[in-house]
């Protein structure tokens, strides 16, 4: 995939960022050992990866979280990889679910999502979780990225 | 990515190997259904994948382990994907954590790590775990690999 | 990897399908936000991805399941990514195992498998699980795919 100017590599890997926002959409930053190949993929508003070129992309996310069954809702912790395309409904691409741990004060678990999807120019992908306050932001624990095939 | 001689495919997939060493670095072997595309990626000392060419790589590891909450330390089982580059800090690229199971004698769990990173010529990647004695080495359970974009 | 006619992109992503069959092989469909790049990869009998060209492929699967320790066998839930090549024995490429949850009625967990493997023309890959009745088929929870490097 070492490509000429006509067909440059497009890839991104961004690092989780703790946020005071109450939104379920995770926040990301270009910090630490991040990757941003060029301006054909960008991190917008710290929350979504947006691509300029149509094509097939392998998109992935990893979320580590710490939760406790008694302190959490009955529902499991769910991480969702979602797609927003211009003029289209948002859609869920991938989801993973983990039941809360009985460990105290909380038990850590990691979720990995990944798949190949066709993206349109201007399409954005983002990650939603049921409870962002449970997400672990220690080095390497939670990240998000993509690569164009 | 079918590439000419100037730009050959570079990929590896190696298989876990039980080790009597007390180190936290996992050991790997070119055995079973392994992949080693050419000499532009090599398995060194059975512990690290080393690349000869600079570029973007998708690097992944999967670790299955069997542990029990009572028999283990309070800390969770953590798997780390780490990078060693000439003249640089070693660094943690990715980590995943799973709290030990209450199942007896032990409960199996699997961790998957993966992300896109820029590697320099001579860079090596390796996998660290908190307790290598808990790792499962049955067919297909624990593996490590990369592919150059 | 935007490639000419000589070297087209080959990728697939298929979506889980509930099945009344008692087989341990998971069923898949080209539905929802699926990917099927061209006829060089096909979904056969709703159960296996078959490739026409030899080469290195990154193959992945994600399985979400809901199980309970008391209602399940002692053995963990295991997901296996398997390979069938013309004139060869079937083989396990990757496996992941998760011990059943103590949550009631069942606890959800997600497994992710992925690795780089050489496939021959006519080779097929499929996913086996210990108990298909426990698999979650909600949007995005369980999927299977590959991409040719």
């Amino acid at each position: 995939m070492q490509k000429g100017d006509q067909n440059p590599q497009i890839a991104a890997h961004v690092i989780s960022e703790a946020s005071s926002k109450t939104t379920s959409v995770l926040q990301w930053a270009e910090k630490g050992y991040y990757t941003m190949s060029n301006n054909l993929v960008t991190l917008e508003n710290g929350k979504q990866l947006t691509v300029k070129r149509q094509g097939l992309y392998y998109i992935y996310a990893q979320v580590t979280f710490c939760s406790n069954r008694e302190a959490s809702s009955q529902a499991p912790f769910i991480a969702s990889l979602c797609l927003k395309s211009p003029g289209r409904f948002e859609r869920i691409l991938l989801r993973a679910a983990n039941t809360h741990s009985s460990a105290k004060p909380c038990g850590q678990q990691s979720i990995h999502l990944g798949g190949v999807f066709e993206l349109q120019p201007g399409a954005s992908v983002f990650v939603n979780v049921t409870d962002p306050s449970q997400v672990s932001h220690g080095t390497g624990f939670t990240s998000f990225g993509l690569l164009k095939l | 990515m079918q590439k000419g001689d100037q730009n050959p495919q570079i990929a590896a997939h190696v298989i876990s190997e039980a080790s009597s060493k007390t180190t936290s670095v996992l050991q790997w072997a070119e055995k079973g259904y392994y992949t080693m595309s050419n000499n532009l990626v090599t398995l060194e000392n059975g512990k690290q994948l080393t690349v000869k060419r600079q570029g973007l790589y998708y690097i992944y590891a999967q670790v299955t382990f069997c542990s029990n909450r009572e028999a283990s330390s309070q800390a969770p089982f953590i798997a780390s994907l780490c990078l060693k580059s000439p003249g640089r800090f070693e660094r943690i690229l990715l980590r995943a954590a799973n709290t030990h199971s209450s199942a007896k004698p032990c409960g199996q769990q699997s961790i998957h790590l993966g992300g896109v990173f820029e590697l320099q010529p001579g860079a090596s990647v390796f996998v660290n775990v908190t307790d290598p004695s808990q790792v499962s080495h049955g067919t297909g359970f624990t593996s490590f690999g990369l592919l150059k974009l | 990897m935007q490639k000419g006619d000589q070297n087209p992109q080959i990728a697939a992503h298929v979506i889980s399908e509930a099945s009344s069959k008692t087989t341990s092989v998971l069923q898949w469909a080209e539905k929802g936000y699926y990917t099927m790049s061209n006829n060089l990869v096909t979904l056969e009998n709703g159960k296996q991805l078959t490739v026409k060209r030899q080469g290195l492929y990154y193959i992945y699967a994600q399985v979400t399941f809901c199980s309970n320790r008391e209602a399940s066998s002692q053995a963990p839930f295991i997901a296996s990514l398997c390979l069938k090549s013309p004139g060869r024995f079937e083989r396990i490429l990757l496996r992941a195992a998760n011990t059943h949850s103590s949550a009631k009625p069942c606890g959800q967990q997600s497994i992710h498998l992925g690795g780089v493997f050489e496939l021959q023309p006519g080779a097929s890959v499929f996913v086996n699980v210990t108990d298909p009745s426990q698999v979650s088929h909600g949007t995005g929870f369980t999927s299977f795919g590959l991409l040719k490097l």
């Epitope: 890997h13 991040y34 080095t139 | 640089r88 | -």
Partner: nanobody
Framework: EVQLVESGGGLVQPGGSLRLSCAAS????????MGWFRQAPGKEREFIAV????????LYADSVKGRFTISADNSKNTAYLQMNSLKPEDTAVYYC????????????????WGQGTLVTVSS
């Protein structure tokens, strides 16, 4: 830019211990990781240990695992290297280095360096 000042080097007998300190000043908020390298006469600079400012995670070179411990006191903006069971082959100039936050994997970011402190292990 971050300014780094090392201290704590000196002469020690084999099997002995030393504690090196590295005090940081300047753009402290930009620090992603701090760590130690060493350089013996006629040899290349060698990585020893690193600690991540964010959460205290650490990594060590194989040659010092189990003998050296890196730690940090964020309130004092200082990193430490506790060196136990010292051997003659640990003799070198020890350099503290800091890596900035937005270092990225696609650019070989420059580290900020201290001036070095000499550690001599000899009987």
């Amino acid at each position: 830019e971050v300014q780094l000042v090392e201290s704590g080097g000196g002469l020690v007998q084999p099997g002995g211990s030393l504690r090196l300190s590295c005090a940081a000043s300047g753009s402290i908020s930009s620090i992603h990781a701090m760590g130690w390298f060493r350089q013996a006469p006629g040899k290349e600079r060698e990585f020893i240990a690193v600690i991540y400012w964010r959460d205290g995670s650490s990594l060590y070179a194989d040659s010092v695992k189990g003998r050296f411990t890196i730690s940090a006191d964020n309130s004092k903006n200082t990193a430490y290297l506790q060196m136990n069971s010292l051997k003659p082959e640990d003799t070198a100039v020890y350099y503290c280095a800091a890596e900035p936050y937005g270092s990225g994997s696609s650019l070989m970011s420059e580290y900020d360096w201290g001036q070095g402190t000499l550690v001599t292990v000899s009987s």
